[in-house]
Interface confidence: medium
């Protein structure tokens, strides 16, 4: 490699520090916050991205009704503990020794407790429902065009295998994207639906995680698709354990 390549970068994660100190002088990138090496040919795990974000300076309905067990991330940002493979540790604790259990996308799935709280396993989120409301347009989008464009986006930008995009529902102005991925379905090298959903969420908010890219310019047959509200519901393989029944949207 030439000297000009010494300023190597990570195309899939701008929240990295990169240098040519990998095997054979190859470009190696490490996530901010954790310092863990990341694979820049695919998406970085949500846990490492959240950790990097926290380390950065602060600045007749066809629609799906989320089940009573659906979780919404109401707790906001926190500095997570990630395992050596970049996944969320099942138990998360804050600096005041308050602990809780999370699912594979890092969303709290139990009441908060103290250091004695046990989280026996990291429960997999196998179904994600992304609920979008688009800004007013002259007319409704063609459902099949919208479906094709969103599937293409997840396949080509986030490299999510098409079989994991279960459905795209549309009832103007609401769009719902269903991602499904059981533990048994996810093969080595497959992008995780939780990571794809997180990259999509950040893209939609104009906070792209990709290096050197502008905001996501999502178009359906040339018509801009501008999102004004996003809600994401997470369903786990094992229902969450809260002491009081929580209201869902």
């Amino acid at each position: 490699h030439t000297a000009a390549q010494d300023n190597c970068t990570c195309p899939t994660n701008k929240m990295t520090v990169c240098s040519p100190d990998g095997p054979g002088g190859r470009c190696q990138c490490r996530a901010l916050g954790s310092g863990m090496a990341v694979d820049c040919s695919t998406l970085t795990s949500k846990c490492l991205l959240l950790k990097a974000r926290m380390s950065a300076p602060k600045n007749a309905r066809t629609l799906v009704r989320p089940s009573e067990h659906a979780l919404v991330d109401n707790d906001g940002l926190y500095d997570p503990d990630c395992d050596p493979e970049g996944r969320f540790k099942a138990r998360q604790c804050n600096q005041t020794s308050v602990c809780w259990c999370v699912n594979s996308v890092g969303v709290r799935r139990t009441d908060k407790g103290d250091l004695s709280l046990r989280c026996d396993e990291l429960v997999r989120t196998h179904h994600i429902l992304i609920d979008l409301r688009h800004r007013p347009t002259a007319g409704a989008f063609n459902h099949s065009d919208l479906d094709a464009e969103l599937r293409r986006l997840f396949r080509e930008r986030y490299r999510l295998h098409p079989k994991f995009v279960a459905a795209v529902h549309y009832e103007q102005p609401t769009i719902q994207i269903e991602l499904r991925q059981n533990t048994s379905q996810k093969a080595a090298g497959d992008v995780d639906i939780g990571d794809a959903a997180y990259y999509f969420e950040r893209d939609i908010k104009g906070e792209s995680l990709f290096q050197g890219r502008g905001g996501l310019d999502l178009r359906v047959r040339g018509e801009p698709l501008q999102v004004e509200r996003t809600l994401i519901y997470y369903l786990d393989e094992i229902p969450p354990k809260f002491s009081m029944k929580r209201l869902t949207a």
Epitope: T2, A4, C10, S41, L153, R157, G212, R213, D217
Partner: nanobody, 123 residues
């Protein structure tokens, strides 16, 4: 300094073949997806084909599917476009572009472009 330099263009007969090359330098070629795009006289830029960083997936515009083949040699930092069964409507200036995914064709968000190589298909 990042550079992408296209070559291999020229005059071809209808039904003929050409192979375009793109030599990249100044960035870590093996970690970036790459694309080919073209601009015909008096027309807008048209995305032609894209390939993932590791070559594991390729994409083509409908107009070239089955006739063009994109490939790459990461050891040589080179991108290729094999063009077969050429048609007069393939006449254009062909550009090599650094881009993460095929989806970037919607954004026009490529970071780096070459100067282009001219392909003319005529009898």
């Amino acid at each position: 300094e990042v550079q992408v330099v296209e070559s291999g263009g020229g005059l071809a007969q209808p039904g003929g073949s050409l192979r375009l090359s793109c030599a990249a330098s100044g960035f870590w070629f093996s970690t970036y997806a790459m694309s080919w795009a073209r601009q015909a006289p008096g027309k807008g830029l048209e995305w032609v084909s894209g390939i993932y960083a590791d070559g594991s997936a390729t994409y083509y515009a409908d107009s070239v599917k089955g006739r063009f083949t994109i490939s790459r040699d990461n050891a040589k930092n080179t991108l290729y476009l094999h063009m077969n069964s050429l048609k007069p409507e393939d006449t254009a200036l062909y550009y090599c572009a650094q881009g993460y995914s095929d989806y970037d064709r919607r954004v026009g968000g490529y970071d780096y472009w070459g100067q282009g190589t001219q392909v003319t298909v005529s009898s």
